[in-house]
Interface confidence: medium
Amino acid sequence: EAHKSEIAHRYNDLGEQHFKGLVLIAFSQYLQKCSYDEHAKLVQEVTDFAKTCVADESAANCDKSLHTLFGDKLCAIPNLRENYGELADCCTKQEPERNECFLQHKDDNPSLPPFERPEAEAMCTSFKENPTTFMGHYLHEVARRHPYFYAPELLYYAEQYNEILTQCCAEADKESCLTPKLDGVKEKALVSSVRQRMKCSSMQKFGERAFKAWAVARLSQTFPNADFAEITKLATDLTKVNKECCHGDLLECADDRAELAKYMCENQATISSKLQTCCDKPLLKKAHCLSEVEHDTMPADLPAIAADFVEDQEVCKNYAEAKDVFLGTFLYEYSRRHPDYSVSLLLRLAKKYEATLEKCCAEANPPACYGTVLAEFQPLVEEPKNLVKTNCDLYEKLGEYGFQNAILVRYTQKAPQVSTPTLVEAARNLGRVGTKCCTLPEDQRLPCVEDYLSAILNRVCLLHEKTPVSEHVTKCCSGSLVERRPCFSALTVDETYVPKEFKAETFTFHSDICTLPEKEKQIKKQTALAELVKHKPKATAEQLKTVMDDFAQFLDTCCKAADKDTCFSTEGPNLVTRCKDALA
């Protein structure tokens, strides 16, 4: 229904707290360099204006679109050109071009320092003094570093943060209560960020149809008892929600997501028997819970997929009559039977099925032609299954850090032109797949591994797009989203690469490394490993292991030495010489 004032409508629907949080996220995601105080001031102005519109929808400017209102606010910021360069040119445009322009200037890798967590005592003090400001800082800091973070989900993580602080700040040992809990939230939030970025990439590069196909597959796996019309209803609504969030329409997105959660809870009978626990929760928790609800039990009497899609005499007629619906029902029927497959794999199978029908339905004897299509799925299914087995075996043998190093070597060989920080970040993230997925039951491993890897590789592609340096990466990132992971897996050593010359300073370390937290130490060592591979792309695993073991021993020795600086300055050059010899 049309509302006289869009901003009043959203304020009323969302309530003041969520309204303010979402406006803060929106501004922080658009203008990523502004301070919290600058954004908080704008948020208060927008909220005050919204309240005047709630009181009188006919008041001046209340009928303006949200993009116009928000864009005007952003464009009124002083020193916009000095701080944001050509983003200021967006302000010369009219809506909707102005909003599109803002979206194009979102930076996936802003040059902001890592978000450092204050020590427990200080955190608790500032939280107790002003919880609202404290949570505002959290929303601002996360949103500006993750400009496509799913806004209603970020409100959920802020709520989790709040609950953890409320609980732990009342404890005697605040640190040991806070650290593991906040680490858990941080890990989940980072995964949520890369997953959502993948959804926005799908929407931006391939349009709504591609996202809707993803949603149909995913929802069919989770709700195998819902009928096709129900699944497409949910997929259509979910597509709208994600389109809005990816497009910066955060108030609409959060409002529609709440509506979708309400619809699901009111229609459990036709969707799934597993929703009740989620539906008993308050809004943010309910929507989060529904997004990761366990799969419903599959119907016992499902006929073989071949009956309708291979053996039926009217396959080509059904396909010709309504291609999208017929392919949609195929994707639905296949997905509901295979909760053990990744969405990426299901979409590859649907693509293969479509290509087969396109070819065969034009031939003299279509059934003879498409009769073997299910057998042709076999290699497509085996490839990711083998990937999971090989990588989980390796993870179990090496542990997370060792597994990350193996991936780092592999990916540096595939794309040695990529910057070392990007390679290290990618390898560390890809390596976490082991901890995240390899410990799961067998039937959950494949969807966990492949869909997570796809999301991480999407980030690699986004970073590479900014400064394209590797033809290998460009090739894999240019294709369809579902083919990316197999493409990267199939890459071998880049034979066109001219090895980097050996620079001693790259492998020179100082005693300050000793006091770094374990994670930072690992990153330093992994940076050195990537540089070694860039110097010797064809070094054997054995050679690299020798060098890295020597390096670890050197760090251990010098960090335990009484005079660390002397140890580093005398033993360091010896290490560099040994490394050169080992790789010669």
Partner: nanobody, 119 residues
Framework: EVQLLESGGGLVQPGGSLRLSCAAS????????MLWVRQAPGKGLEWVSV????????YYADSVKGRFTISRDNSKNTLYLQMNSLRAEDTAVYYC????????????RGQGTLVTVSS
């Protein structure tokens, strides 16, 4: 027991319009997706359009897209099909049906109403 009763068919000239209705009883209409199917003389059944229980989304066979509109009134347990720009090839018996899980197959349908498009 499920009952579906179609009405509104008749003879119409090419380019003309008709509105079909289907009164449903014996099941919870507002939790059931519904569809219209048709059977032309001497041909097999062909699905025409599907509507979700809530009224959106809707789906159409390519042959009727842009000309036919499916809708429903859950308070009256009634399904509708508005047919515009009718063509001779739309001549068929039109059935409303309850939409189940499997593909575009359907379990319950009514007796049908005949639509004849002829000059």
């Amino acid at each position: 027991e499920v009952q579906l009763l179609e009405s509104g068919g008749g003879l119409v000239q090419p380019g003309g319009s008709l509105r079909l209705s289907c009164a449903a009883s014996g099941f919870t209409f507002d939790t059931s997706s519904m569809l219209w199917v048709r059977q032309a003389p001497g041909k097999g059944l062909e699905w025409v359009s599907v509507i979700h229980q809530s009224g959106t989304p809707t789906y159409y066979a390519d042959s009727v897209k842009g000309r036919f509109t499916i809708s429903r009134d859950n308070s009256k347990n009634t399904l509708y099909l508005q047919m515009n720009s009718l063509r001779a090839e739309d001549t068929a018996v039109y059935y409303c049906a309850k939409f189940p899980s499997r593909k575009m197959k359907f379990d319950y349908r009514g007796q049908g109403t005949l639509v004849t498009v002829s000059s």
